[in-house]
Structures are given as structure tokens and as C-alpha cells.
Interface confidence: low
């Protein structure tokens, strides 16, 4: 029996379409596939950012694959051809690996890139990113922010920069249609007359950096002689009620009585007849049903009841 062999894919390359980290891995069929015309050839693709311990592995019949990478580091990938056992009357046959790498030649020393990049998606509506200039740059340095997510034809530059001393230190984004639950790519590069500036790349998903508005319209309602119901309204905006967690802080006569996390817009509190003053504040956060992470809102305005009999039927501000 002659040993069945197959060649690796040809022209394996990583192509950067200018999407700030979303790259195309593409290849052509191997040479000499004539013997296997009745066969569906498969490809095993492995790729990772250089420095990562684990490879991502994909098996596909296609001649391309797309994924997001961290362009602050290089990328390495390898691919080989797989002939399924149905094609070889026996065990699966694999070709040798074809390998390729990709990286953006870094310009400038690391100290010139932006520091402390911070992005917040306020109320799931307004994205704002801010940064500090690199520690090794002069005042003539200016930074530019570009962004892309799937659905945009090409990367867009920020059009509404936040400035300090003439330098761009942040970006207010326009309305970002259909931009959540997918990777959002950002590049902040820079220019200076005196020295090259290192670019920085960032990737996140918008639903994971949401900071909601605080809850509003806090009220008290007496439920029974020893129970008071605290109620509030969800903040306005596109975040549905099912997506909120709340943290309540309740003070009775200047002593912190309760800190609790709840999922609805009510909380029932046991009280005593001796209570003279009751105050509470609430804050909100997107919960695990709608995101993997989030940022607590500011605390609501404090709502207090004092100086009157707490056994009244309804206590409203």
C-alpha cells in the first residue's frame, strides 16, 4: 500500500482590512487534490496572540476565517489539511503545518502611548472614552481615536474630542446603532513633530461597560405596623427592567441598618415603633442576565422620612 499524503493549504496569510484588530485568515486549497475529487477536504486552523498560552482551534471547510485580535501584540497562526477517514479507507490523514505571522510594526517607545484608557457606556446610550497623554510626550503631541464594530463599512474617527490644554484626552461617540453584544475595537494613535507615537488598541463589548442612571422617584409605603415598603422607579432609557440589579443602603436614626442587593424595584423593611428617622438611597447596575460586567450607577438622591409618626398609611416625598 502506498502511503496517502496531502499537502498543506497554499498562500496562507493574515490580512488586516483596517478594522483595528478584526483580521481575516485566508488560504487556498492544497496542490494535488486531484486524487480526492470525491472528498470534502477540511482544514484545522490554530491561531493566537503571541504570548498567549493557548491556541484557538477551528475546523472548517471554508478557505477563510475571521476573528478579533489584540494588535498591541503579534499574531501567529498555523493551518493544515485534513482528509477524513472516509476519503482514505482508514484513518484521518493530516498534512504538515503551514504557518504565518502578523504584527503592526510598533512606532515610538511604549511611554508615548495613551495611559489609563477608560470607556463607559452611559445608560446603554452614550459611549465616552477618556485617557491621559503618554508620560513621554510633549505638548505638541495629539492623539486620534478610531473605532470599528461589525456593521460599519470602515473604521471611523472620533468627531467630538474632549480636550485639555489643546490636547485630545477623550472622545464622545455619536449614537452607535446595533453595536452591543459584539466586539468593539478602538485604536488611539498619535502624532508629534518630535518623535513617533506608539498606537494603542482596545477591544470590549459595550454591554459590559454600562453605567446606568440612578433610580428615581423613591417612596415609602406602610405595609403593616412593623413593615415599610421602599419603592423606586427604573431610570429612563433603553435598559429594560429585567436587566437591573439594585443596591440599597438604609439608615435608621443615623445608623446604617441594611445594605441589600435586590432584583426588583421594591424592598420590604422591618421597623420598630421607636424609629424616628428613616433614610434610603438606591443605585443600579446591569445584571448578569444582560451582561458579563457593569458599573454601578451613582447613588440616587436620598429619600428620608423624619419628625412624624412612621405608622402613617403612606409616606411620600
Amino acid at each position: 500500500d502506498t502511503e496517502i499524503k496531502v499537502n498543506p493549504p497554499q498562500d496562507f496569510e493574515i490580512v488586516d482590512p483596517g478594522y483595528l484588530g478584526y483580521l481575516y485568515l485566508q488560504w487556498q486549497p492544497p496542490l494535488s487534490l486531484d486524487h480526492f475529487k470525491e472528498c470534502t477536504v477540511e482544514y484545522e486552523l490554530k491561531y493566537r496572540n503571541i504570548g498567549s498560552e493557548t491556541w484557538k482551534t477551528i475546523i472548517t471547510k471554508n478557505l477563510h476565517y475571521k476573528d478579533g485580535f489584540d494588535l498591541n501584540k503579534g499574531i501567529e497562526a498555523k493551518i493544515h489539511t485534513l482528509l477524513p477517514w472516509q476519503c482514505t479507507n482508514g484513518s484521518e490523514v493530516q498534512s504538515s503545518w503551514a504557518e504565518t505571522t502578523y504584527w503592526i510594526s510598533p512606532q515610538g517607545i511604549p511611554e508615548t502611548k495613551v495611559q489609563d484608557m477608560d470607556c463607559v457606556y452611559y445608560n446603554w446610550q452614550y459611549l465616552l472614552c477618556s485617557w491621559k497623554p503618554g508620560i513621554g510626550v510633549l505638548l505638541d503631541t495629539n492623539y486620534n481615536l478610531f473605532y470599528w464594530y461589525e456593521g460599519l463599512d470602515h473604521a471611523l474617527q472620533c468627531v467630538d474630542y474632549i480636550k485639555a490644554d489643546g490636547q485630545n484626552i477623550g472622545c464622545r461617540f455619536p449614537y452607535l446603532e446595533a453595536s452591543d453584544y459584539k466586539d468593539f475595537y478602538i485604536c488611539v494613535n498619535g502624532s508629534s513633530e518630535n518623535k513617533p507615537i506608539r498606537s494603542s488598541y482596545f477591544t470590549f463589548q459595550l454591554q459590559n461597560i454600562v453605567k446606568p442612571l440612578p433610580p428615581v422617584y423613591l417612596t415609602f409605603t406602610r405595609e403593616s405596623s412593623c413593615e415599610i415598603k421602599l419603592k423606586w422607579s427604573i431610570p429612563l432609557g433603553p435598559i429594560p427592567a429585567r436587566c437591573f440589579d439594585y443596591e440599597i443602603e438604609i439608615r435608621e436614626d443615623d445608623t446604617t441598618l441594611v445594605t441589600a442587593t435586590v432584583e426588583n424595584e421594591t424592598y420590604t423593611l422591618k421597623t420598630t415603633n421607636e424609629t424616628r428617622q428613616l433614610c434610603f438611597v438606591v443605585r443600579s447596575k446591569v445584571n448578569i442576565y444582560c451582561s458579563d460586567d457593569g458599573i454601578w450607577s451613582e447613588w440616587s438622591d436620598k429619600q428620608c422620612w423624619e419628625g412624624e409618626d412612621l405608622s402613617k398609611k403612606t409616606l411620600l416625598r
Epitope: V216, L236, G237, K302
Partner: antibody
């Protein structure tokens, strides 16, 4: 409880100015805008403008832009609205009204100040 | 400026009746998925009271019989079962654009 207490009624002559105050209590003053709304006798409501109690930023109705000035004193949690070059059609009850943000409505109102412009 | 047209300008109704007041804006008052439309109740000699904000959200402590609906340019305030204390004048108000503007009012009287 949230309270907005306005200054008392005024009778002023045409061409003069009036300054109405609105003292807030029972909430974090600088977290809110203060709006001013007027109502002529037997008429509807008319928005004059608003001031951000934190930054002092103002948004005026163009109709009053050249005659109105709104100011804030955070040390006393008081907002002022001054209207100049008064004429008889400025006779109205002037209200201050608290607002958290554009979409939240004016949720607490002062008791109103009657300004009568008469010679 | 955005004009608001309320109808009817007045109506007579009895206790227990279902009352509907409409407000039409000269252009859309929607933005970012929010309708910037509010409803107020005013009794003679008193300051207005917020009933509904953002078209359908109830103000603090308002009775459940008051409800708001609508989006874009057409909005409705409904009182599901009129009570004696509900006889008053009702105003719609937009806060999408400065200057904020009010409807002309609807006076609800006892039949």
C-alpha cells in the same frame, strides 16, 4: 420632604425689573435643574427657562432671552429669576419647578409668585 | 418651536367615567427611544402637579388610575375611573427641545 419656597407677591411699574427667589430644601440641590414657568391670569403655562444648580448653565426661551437672567446661590440653595423691561402682559404667577433631566418632568413646584405690572 | 395641540379643550364627565385627553405635537418628541412628553394636573390657585413623565411613566405617588401612552407626535392621558378630586385642568408638555412648550390645557368639569 422636597420643598420649593418662593418670595412674596410683587407689584411693579412698567419698564421696571422684578427678581423672584426660590429656596430649595429636602434634596441634593446641585443634582437638579431649576425651571421657571409662568401663567398669566386665566391662561396656560409658558416655560421661561432653566438653570443647572451645579454649573450655573442656563437655557432660556428665545422669547425672554434679552430680558431674563437666572442665577443660583448654592450656599443658600436658592435660585433667582430676574425679568426686566416689564410690561402689562408680564402680569402672571411665576413658578419655579425642579427637574432632574429633560425626560423626567418637573416633579416639584414652588407655590408661585404673583407679579403684577401696573402703573 | 414645537407646538402642542390638546383636545378637547374642555369636557364634562361624571364620577366613575373613563376620560381620555389627547395631545398632538407638531413634530416628533421622541429621541433615543424615549418620548419627551409629560402630563400635569392643575387645580385653581395651585401649582401644577406632575402626573406622567416620559409619556407613560407615573410620577411619585400618583394614583394608578392615571396612565399615559403614545409616541412620536400623538399622546394620550387616560383617567380610568374619574374621582371627585380629579376635576381639574390637565396640560401636556414636551421637553425634547428648548423652548419647552405646553398644550393649551383640557378642563375636566363635573357633568
Amino acid at each position: 420632604q422636597v420643598q420649593l419656597v418662593q418670595s412674596g407677591a410683587e407689584v411693579v411699574k412698567p419698564g421696571a425689573s422684578v427678581k423672584v427667589s426660590c429656596k430649595a430644601s429636602g434634596y441634593t440641590f446641585t443634582n437638579y435643574w431649576m425651571n421657571w414657568v409662568r401663567q398669566a391670569p386665566g391662561q396656560g403655562l409658558e416655560w421661561i427657562g432653566r438653570i443647572d444648580a451645579y454649573a450655573g448653565e442656563t437655557h432660556y426661551n428665545q422669547k425672554f432671552k434679552d430680558r431674563v437672567t437666572m442665577t443660583v446661590d448654592t450656599s443658600t440653595s436658592t435660585v433667582y429669576m430676574e425679568l426686566s423691561s416689564l410690561r402689562s402682559e408680564d402680569t402672571a404667577v411665576y413658578y419655579c419647578a425642579r427637574g432632574y433631566g429633560d425626560a423626567y418632568g418637573m416633579d416639584h413646584w414652588g407655590q408661585g409668585t404673583l407679579v403684577t405690572v401696573s402703573s | 418651536d414645537i407646538q402642542l395641540t390638546q383636545s378637547p379643550s374642555s369636557l364634562s364627565a361624571s364620577v366613575g367615567d373613563r376620560v381620555t385627553i389627547t395631545c398632538r405635537a407638531s413634530e416628533s418628541v421622541d429621541n433615543y427611544g424615549i418620548s419627551f412628553m409629560n402630563w400635569f394636573q392643575q387645580k385653581p390657585g395651585k401649582a401644577p402637579k406632575l402626573l406622567i413623565y416620559a409619556a407613560s411613566r407615573q410620577g411619585s405617588g400618583d394614583p394608578a388610575r392615571f396612565s399615559g401612552s403614545g409616541s412620536g407626535t400623538d399622546f394620550t392621558l387616560t383617567i380610568s375611573s374619574l374621582q371627585p378630586e380629579d376635576f381639574a385642568t390637565y396640560f401636556c408638555q414636551q421637553s425634547k427641545e428648548v423652548p419647552w412648550t405646553f398644550g393649551g390645557g383640557t378642563k375636566v368639569e363635573i357633568k
